[in-house]
Structures are given as structure tokens and as C-alpha cells.
């Protein structure tokens, strides 16, 4: 008996061939001997089966001795043995229809679980193997689960269902809703304008939701809300903003925030949370602000940084075009009695300068100038 695998919702064509290459009488029946369709001369006739409105044949092939049964919009319950009767012989074809669906939605938040469920006919024992867009293979029976979805899991998942050494392939498009970056860090000199950007890693036609930037300043004992906002069809409207700092928010995507000036009391880390309509759970992006200040007080030249710096970052003070006078893995460095000239304060990571502030030290009889 020939086995044919079909996909739920698809169309399948079951073949039936006579030895004579001409149009002769044929009938297709199911395992209960109920007629599905056949011919009377050149006319297609249909029987009382439940496939009535979804069954068809190709009259153009009858003259060549081919009498296919076409079943449209396949259902799991169409799985059956179909019998073609032609020239006093019977050809049996076993049709097995499978369906593969993603749990609830194909748009999932980063960190959520994806469950793929296989619908299969009674008596079948298929195996399923799925390959994610990043090449990860998962295997299972009726259900396959992937926990903690990551951004790289966005794209087409290809799943192969194997039964009776035949296979059928399903493609499911999954969209992982996430920010492009889980975390970002902004380095600024004191007084500079700060731009925070929160680009999304997906595009949808209508994006509606709400969000909040919650901030923990390094110098503050507790965290607080800096801004709350709504998102309606990709238009941003500010709901509430703290009075200090006076943040501004762009009206269009990507989500964009401007802090008029970087000050030591703002240095710290924040968490932008975005809740999307009709989704349980939230998207998060961490953002960090490091602020540098270089000052000269009397005979002491000081450079300080505030905010979340890694212990491997190096803070240095050097006179322009000279070797560093002081260089430490600390958040403050200073030079006593600095000589006149343009001094540079540098925050660097493995030799790469992340932040630089210049301060001009004048001869001792005058006051310092900040360029």
C-alpha cells in the first residue's frame, strides 16, 4: 500500500493510473467503501462522502489513463485509505495528514517559550525534528518546546515530520519581540547632551503599548521613574516625566530619549520596560550612563567618573603628547601641582579610549580654563 503524507490546509493529489492510455471508467472510494468521485463518460460525478466539496480530479489527464483524486484544504480527519477502482483492479493509497502549529501566537517576547504542537491522525507514530533559524535542532513527539527564546530565534523554523519513511516539511515564521540590544552604555563628559536610543529588533504594522524608564542613580539611595509613556500605532506620547532631570522623548520610533546635560547625579543605570498590547510580559533594555568630570582646585587637578564602570577600565591623567602622569583602575585620579598645559583625562578599556575630557592648566598665577 502506497503511503502519502499531507499537510493540514494544503492540497494533495493521489495518483491512479490505468494500463490503457485512454479515458475509462474509474471510482475513488474511502475505506468505508463510500464513493468520493468517479466519471461517467467525460463527466465528473461525486458520491456522498464528507469530502464532496473538497474533492476533484483532473479531466485533462483522463485521456492519458491518469485518474487523480485531488483533496483541497486537508483536514487531519481526511487521513484514511483511499481506493481507486479502475480496469477491475484496486489501487490503495494511505493518506496521513499532519498539522504543526505554534502555541497561541507566532509573535513571542524574548525569554518566553515556544511550543510547537503536532496534530496527527490516530494510529500514527510520527517523529518531528525542527531546525531553528540559528541552526539549533530540537526533536520530539507530539510537542516540542523551546524555552527562553532569544533574538536569534526569529525567522523561519523548518520542521520535518517523519512517518513510514516518508517525510513532510513545515515552515513556521516566528517573530521574537525584543530590543536590538539587551544593554547599552553611554559615556559622556559633564554638561554634554545625552542621547539614549532603544531600537526594536522587529517591525510590525501597528505597534501599541506603554513603557517606563526606571533609573537607579549611583549617588541615590533608591531608584525612581524618569519617564512613562504610551505608544499608539508607533506614535509616542509622554505620560509623565520627572522634573529632574527634564527628559525629552522623541514622538516616533525608535524610542529615543534626550537628557539635556550629563551630570554626576544622573550617572547610573536604567531599565526601559515596554509592554506591548495583547502580550503578557514585557521587553527590557538596560541602559547605563557614565559621566566624567575634570576639575582643578588650587594645586590639585582631579579627574572623576561616575556610573557603572567595569573594574578593568583605566582612568588616566596626562599632559598632551606626554606619557600618563597617573593611571589607575579607579574612579578618581589626581595630580598635585600640575604643570601648565592642556591636560587630558582618559577613560579607556584595553587601550581604547571611551571618554576624554580636556582641561587647560594655566601658570599658577591664573585660574584654569575648560575648553
Amino acid at each position: 500500500k502506497k503511503v502519502v503524507l499531507g499537510k493540514k490546509g494544503d492540497t494533495v493529489e493521489l495518483t491512479c493510473t490505468a494500463s490503457q492510455k485512454k479515458s475509462i471508467q474509474f471510482h475513488w472510494k474511502n475505506s468505508n467503501q463510500i464513493k468520493i468521485l468517479g466519471n461517467q463518460g467525460s463527466f465528473l460525478t461525486k458520491g456522498p462522502s464528507k469530502l464532496n466539496d473538497r474533492a476533484d480530479s483532473r479531466r485533462s489527464l483522463w485521456d492519458q489513463g491518469n485518474f487523480p483524486l485531488i483533496i483541497k484544504n486537508l483536514k487531519i480527519e481526511d487521513s484514511d485509505t483511499y481506493i481507486c477502482e479502475v480496469e477491475d483492479q484496486k489501487e490503495e493509497v494511505q493518506l496521513l495528514v499532519f498539522g504543526l502549529t505554534a502555541n497561541s501566537d507566532t509573535h513571542l517576547l524574548q525569554g518566553q517559550s515556544l511550543t510547537l504542537t503536532l496534530e496527527s491522525p490516530p494510529g500514527s507514530s510520527p517523529s518531528v525534528q525542527c531546525r531553528s533559524p540559528r541552526g539549533k535542532n530540537i526533536q520530539g513527539g507530539k510537542t516540542l518546546s523551546v524555552s527562553q527564546l532569544e533574538l536569534q530565534d526569529s525567522g523561519t523554523w523548518t520542521c520535518t515530520v517523519l512517518q513510514n519513511q516518508k517525510k513532510v516539511e513545515f515552515k513556521i515564521d516566528i517573530v521574537v519581540l525584543a530590543f536590538q540590544k539587551a544593554s547599552s552604555i553611554v559615556y559622556k563628559k559633564e554638561g554634554e547632551q545625552v542621547e539614549f536610543s532603544f531600537p526594536l529588533a522587529f517591525t510590525v504594522e501597528k505597534l501599541t503599548g506603554s513603557g517606563e524608564l526606571w533609573w537607579q542613580a549611583e549617588r541615590a539611595s533608591s531608584s525612581k521613574s524618569w519617564i512613562t509613556f504610551d505608544l499608539k500605532n508607533k506614535e509616542v506620547s509622554v505620560k509623565r516625566v520627572t522634573q529632574d532631570p527634564k527628559l525629552q522623548m522623541g514622538k516616533k520610533l525608535p524610542l529615543h530619549l534626550t537628557l539635556p546635560q550629563a551630570l554626576p547625579q544622573y550617572a547610573g543605570s536604567g531599565n526601559l520596560t515596554l509592554a506591548l498590547e495583547a502580550k503578557t510580559g514585557k521587553l527590557h533594555q538596560e541602559v547605563n550612563l557614565v559621566v566624567m568630570r575634570a576639575t582643578q582646585l588650587q594645586k590639585n587637578l582631579t579627574c572623576e567618573v561616575w556610573g557603572p564602570t567595569s573594574p578593568k577600565l583605566m582612568l588616566s591623567l596626562k599632559l598632551e603628547n606626554k606619557e600618563a602622569k597617573v593611571s589607575k583602575r579607579e574612579k578618581a585620579v589626581w595630580v598635585l601641582n600640575p604643570e601648565a598645559g592642556m591636560w587630558q583625562c582618559l577613560l579607556s578599556d584595553s587601550g581604547q579610549v571611551l571618554l576624554e575630557s580636556n582641561i587647560k592648566v594655566l601658570p599658577t598665577w591664573s585660574t584654569p580654563v575648560q575648553p
Partner: antibody, heavy 119, light 107 residues
Framework: EVQLVESGGGLVQPGGSLRLSCAAS????????MSWVRQAPGKGLEWVAN????????YYVDSVKGRFTISRDNAKNSLYLQLNSLRAEDTAMYYC????????????WGQGTLVTVSS | DIQMTQSPSSVSASVGDRVTITCRAS??????LAWYQQKPGKAPKVLIY???SFQSGVPSRFSGSGSGTDFILTISSLQPEDFATYYC?????????FGQGTKVEIK
């Protein structure tokens, strides 16, 4: 430790006035919106009014508009609710609450002060 | 004004039971929804904000879900200290409004 302590409640005749106070401590009072919420005996919670950090924005529930006034004194770390033209239906426990929680939630509440309007 | 309707108004349950309280807003409130717990003679305390996020210190048996206009507070396994009245509250638009409350009583 964040603390909110209400005072000023008491028995007042219909048409009378009261001034409720809320003394805040343990946090930077001037950085937060503040709210008043009331609860009639045996009934549910009803949000009454709120005020922004510097007192320039105020919102009220319709039933108290024109009769109640919310204000604050950041120098004294105090929130106030002036209750005028009081009615029997204003009888309730009045709570002061800080809008310091995420997603605009009321994260700290006082223990309340009882206002009874009766002749 | 946005009306918040809670159901049921009261529920009798035993320790270990799963309790579900629903809250329906008269119009969409996005994720501006919080749940509060109040015990007799005490001030309310926030359990959940932004529909589904826990306030720190709140046991994980409490969970929130929903979106738009329909929201649910679930207590997965009721503990003796959970017998109280629960309120939902919207902060989408002024005036902020609370649900009428759901009293969770001992069966």
C-alpha cells in the same frame, strides 16, 4: 525607611471644613507625585486627588472638584488636603500615598486619618 | 471616567486553593494596571504593577495577566495570610479608579 503619617481628621458638621496633613519621611519628598485615596466605612477604595513634584499639576475626582484642594510644602516634607463644604458622603478614612512605584503604582501608604461628617 | 469592574465581589476558599480574580476596564488601559491587597484596619499594599510585574517582596504565588480591558489576578495556592480584600486600579487616565474589591474569605 519610608513613612507617611496622616493627621487632621475628626468629626465635622455638614458644610464644615477640615485640613488633612501628611508628614513624609525617609525619602526625597520633592521628587515624587503624591495622592490622596479615601475609603468609606465598609466600602472600597476611591482615589481623590494627586499633585506633581512642585505642585504645578493637580488632578481631582469629579465628586470633590471645587470643594477639595490638594497642596504640598516640599520644605516641610508635607502633603495637604483642604476639605470644604463637607457632605455626609465624604465620611471616610483618608490615606496619603506616594506614587513611587513602577507603572505609576502607589508604593507607600500612610495608616490613614478618619473624617466623619455628621450633624 | 474609566470604570473598573471586579468579579467576584467575594470568594470563599480554603488554604491551598487556586483563586482567580478578574478585573474589567470600561475602555483600554494598556498596561497601567496595579493590584493591591488590603487587610482589615490596615492600609492597602501594592502586589502587582504594570499588569504582571511583582512588587519586591511579594510571594510568587501571586501573578497577574491580561491586556487592554481584561485582567486577572491569580493566587496559585492560597495561604492563611492571603485572606484579605483585593483591588485593581487603573492609572491610564485621570481620575484614577479602583475596582470595587474582591474579598477572599475562609471557607
Amino acid at each position: 525607611e519610608v513613612q507617611l503619617v496622616e493627621s487632621g481628621g475628626g468629626l465635622v458638621q455638614p458644610g464644615g471644613s477640615l485640613r488633612l496633613s501628611c508628614a513624609a519621611s525617609g525619602f526625597t519628598f520633592s521628587s515624587y507625585w503624591m495622592s490622596w485615596v479615601r475609603q468609606a466605612p465598609g466600602k472600597g477604595l476611591e482615589w481623590v486627588a494627586n499633585i506633581n513634584q512642585d505642585g504645578s499639576e493637580k488632578y481631582y475626582v469629579d465628586s470633590v472638584k471645587g470643594r477639595f484642594t490638594i497642596s504640598r510644602d516640599n520644605a516641610k516634607n508635607s502633603l495637604y488636603l483642604q476639605l470644604n463644604s463637607l457632605r455626609a458622603e465624604d465620611t471616610a478614612m483618608y490615606y496619603c500615598a506616594r506614587e513611587g512605584g513602577q507603572w505609576l503604582s502607589l508604593d507607600y501608604w500612610g495608616q490613614g486619618t478618619l473624617v466623619t461628617v455628621s450633624s | 471616567d474609566i470604570q473598573m469592574t471586579q468579579s467576584p465581589s467575594s470568594v470563599s476558599a480554603s488554604v491551598g486553593d487556586r483563586v482567580t480574580i478578574t478585573c474589567r476596564a470600561s475602555q483600554g488601559i494598556s498596561s497601567w494596571l496595579a493590584w493591591y491587597q488590603q487587610k482589615p484596619g490596615k492600609a492597602p499594599k501594592v502586589l502587582i504593577y504594570g499588569v504582571s510585574s511583582f512588587q519586591s517582596g511579594v510571594p510568587s504565588r501571586f501573578s497577574g495577566s491580561g491586556s487592554g480591558t481584561d485582567f486577572i489576578l491569580t493566587i496559585s495556592s492560597l495561604q492563611p495570610e492571603d485572606f484579605a480584600t483585593y483591588y485593581c486600579q487603573q492609572a491610564n487616565s485621570f481620575p484614577w479608579t479602583f475596582g470595587q474589591g474582591t474579598k477572599v474569605e475562609i471557607k
